[in-house]
């Protein structure tokens, strides 16, 4: 009986036309939502003038439907048993699942000012930036609508820069009508234990963002894993959002709509400093902000963001060192709300429910030459927003899954 089931599973999880896995893989049958909470700065003047702690108040959720588009350019390669594809990006605002509209205003760090002052560290150039910042009436903070902040706006300061620079700024700009990839993953035909594991991303086996093993593209994209998942496994996956591979470990058994699943979570150890977790040494890319690689819980992904000083963390700086959150008032991290988890059906390896949580932060540093940054006495890793991307198998699909997979086994 078990062998027959194994044989059936192995056949059905292969990523090729005609299998259950392929149909759900090309276009997810699960509704995926991305909720945003924006950190509204309450005391912009005090911060700019006196280098006070930044007081933030989160506002949200603002919800978008995402991952509703089918994979594109799906191409099988029979020679190396891989399938390549592009994952198109799309986001549709869901007013009924949101606390306000896309036109809601927020006081946030001026993304262009923070980024330009970091990218152009030459003192003379910073004086030129200062002139353009002042001429455009820009400041350290700005008021932007949700739509502008997420999807892009024409920045008045960058519009004055005499170099050919992109003048449109947004945390997720460009997003709609773009695609992530090309991904090339193993289809599992020759070896089911490799199914969905990424062979190459954008034509490469490495990212070129990190040193050593940190630069590797490991595991799957977390939508599924090779079948017959064991609780003892460490599940590796790659997330282009955070420009790195990461891993999840078993936490607990969960019953999801009558389907027994394993809850895997991202452990605090994955965010630890190299002092606590030596494997993380290559995620420490500079010595000053990281306090000689002793800070933890924030990941500098500037190399992946054209030099813009973007730092990724868990929401509310969960699992981050006290020095990171010390200059920010109004954060309340808690595991239940702010950690990432994957609920995996162990026989098929399918992720039937997940919550991917992350926070986007920007580094801003004092600058003698830029007047709006001149009074700062310290570096700030400023939280801009955090997001919760969730998906849960629908009731109909869950019934089908119970009858065809878990029901047969039990």
């Amino acid at each position: 009986g078990d062998l027959l089931i194994q044989k059936t599973i192995k056949k059905q999880v292969v990523l090729e036309e005609g299998t259950i896995a392929f149909k759900n893989w090309v276009k997810t049958g699960t509704e995926v939502y991305r909720q945003f909470w924006i950190f509204d700065v309450q005391n912009p003047q005090e911060v700019m003038m006196n280098s006070s702690n930044i007081q933030v108040k989160q506002r949200g959720p603002y919800t978008y439907r995402v991952r509703f588009l089918a994979k594109e350019n799906v191409t099988q390669d029979a020679e190396d048993n891989t399938v390549s594809f592009l994952q198109p990006n799309g986001a549709i605002f869901e007013p009924s699942l949101s606390v306000g509209t896309e036109a809601d205003n927020f006081t946030v760090l001026n993304l262009a000012v923070a980024a330009a002052s970091h990218i152009y560290q030459n003192q003379f150039v910073q004086m030129i930036l200062n002139s353009l910042i002042n001429k455009s009436k820009s400041s350290m903070f700005q008021v932007r609508t949700l739509r502008e902040l997420l999807w892009g706006y024409r920045d008045p300061f960058l519009s004055l820069v005499p170099y050919p620079v992109t003048t449109t700024v947004g945390l997720f700009y460009p997003y709609n009508n773009t695609a992530d990839g090309v991904y090339k993953v193993f289809n599992g035909k020759d070896n089911i234990s490799k199914v969905a594991i990424i062979d190459t991303y954008k034509g490469k086996r490495n990212l070129s963002y990190w040193e050593s093993h940190c630069d590797m593209i490991n595991g799957t994209d977390a939508a599924s894993f090779p079948p017959f998942v064991e609780k003892s496994q460490v599940l590796q996956f790659f997330s282009s959002d955070i420009c790195r591979s990461i891993y999840a470990v078993f936490e607990s058994d969960v019953n999801l709509k009558g389907i027994p699943v394993y809850r895997f979570v991202l452990p605090s150890k994955a965010f630890a400093s190299p002092v606590e977790n030596p494997d993380n040494y290559c995620f420490c890319t500079e010595k000053i902000i990281s306090k000689n690689c002793t800070s933890y819980g924030v990941l500098d992904i500037s190399k992946c963001k054209e030099g813009r000083p973007v730092y990724i963390s868990l929401p509310h700086f969960l699992y981050a060192s006290p020095d990171v959150s010390e200059p920010i008032d109004g954060l309340n991290p808690n595991e239940e709300e702010h950690r990432t988890y994957l609920d995996i059906e162990p026989i098929t390896g399918f992720t039937l429910q997940f919550a991917k949580r992350l926070q986007v932060n920007l580094l801003v540093k004092p600058s003698e030459k830029i007047q709006v940054l001149k009074n700062l006495k310290r570096n700030y890793i400023v939280p801009i927003l955090w997001l919760n991307e969730t998906g849960t198998i629908g009731d109909e699909k869950a019934n089908m899954f119970r009858s065809q997979v878990t029901g047969k086994i039990n």
Epitope: N122, Q123, F124, V125, M127, I128, N130, S131, N134, K135, P162, Y163, E368, K369, Q371, K374
Partner: antibody, heavy 116, light 107 residues
Framework: QVQLQQSGAELVKPGASVKLSCKAS????????MHWVKQRPGQGLEWIGE????????NYNQKFKGKATLTVDKSSSTAYMQLSSLTSEDSAVYYC?????????WGQGTTLTVSS | DIVMTQSQKFLSTSVGDRVSVTCKAS??????VAWYQQKPGQSPKVLIY???YRYSGVPDRFTGSGSGTDFTLTVSNVQSEDLAEYFC?????????FGAGTKLELK
């Protein structure tokens, strides 16, 4: 448009001091750093220093520390450079120039002659 | 301090010619170089910044190139109004330093 009106030519004796002025108009004076440059005949250009008119913070070329003092008067949108203990080596044309896209607007210059 | 060497004190040219003014930095300055034009009795005017970007309003016969330590200002189709002194300036390090200048004169 940006206009910089520098004070007139000065003839001073060695050992004396002089204060050159640069009155700015056509832009927000406190928004742009002001630079001062020296030009001696046939000697090229020498950077003296810079000042942020918003808070009077100044940086100097080591060579001119003790020789030049940069100040501003925000109320009149005027930058000043005082030169002390003058010698014939200080005879030159002195320019003020605010930073916009670089040193792209220069005053007409003030000619200083140090002679007994 | 970074020394900017303009080895040609004078450059003779004719109207319509193409001429190159060179400047050598004593150490790597990236592309943090500007070029200025100065006519007798006038203050300097910026032509080029960031080694190769033409300042607005500057005729396109002026071209800047180079990076690291070697920089060139090229004037193609020289006009009589281009007869002036040309200075390079580095802004990679403080203090800001200028070349001694190159005078463009008629043959």
């Amino acid at each position: 448009q940006v206009q910089l009106q520098q004070s007139g030519a000065e003839l001073v004796k060695p050992g004396a001091s002089v204060k050159l002025s640069c009155k700015a108009s056509g832009y927000t004076f406190t928004s742009y750093w002001m630079h001062w440059v020296k030009q001696r005949p046939g000697q090229g250009l020498e950077w003296i220093g810079e000042i942020d008119p918003s808070d009077s913070h100044a940086n100097y070329n080591q060579k001119f520390k003790g020789k030049a003092t940069l100040t501003v008067d925000k109320s009149s949108s005027t930058a000043y450079m005082q030169l002390s203990s003058l010698t014939s080596e200080d005879s030159a044309v002195y320019y003020c120039a605010p930073i916009y896209y670089g040193l792209d607007n220069w005053g007409q210059g003030t000619t200083l002659t140090v002679s007994s | 301090d970074i020394v900017m060497t303009q080895s040609q004190k004078f450059l003779s040219t004719s109207v319509g010619d193409r001429v190159s003014v060179t400047c050598k930095a004593s150490q790597n300055v990236g592309t943090n170089v500007a070029w200025y034009q100065q006519k007798p009795g006038q203050s300097p005017k910026v032509l080029i910044y960031s080694a190769s970007y033409r300042y607005s309003g500057v005729p396109d016969r002026f071209t800047g190139s180079g990076s690291g330590t070697d920089f060139t200002l090229t004037v193609s189709n020289v006009q009589s109004e281009d007869l002036a002194e040309y200075f390079c300036q580095q802004y990679n390090n403080y203090p800001l330093t200028f070349g001694a200048g190159t005078k463009l004169e008629l043959k």
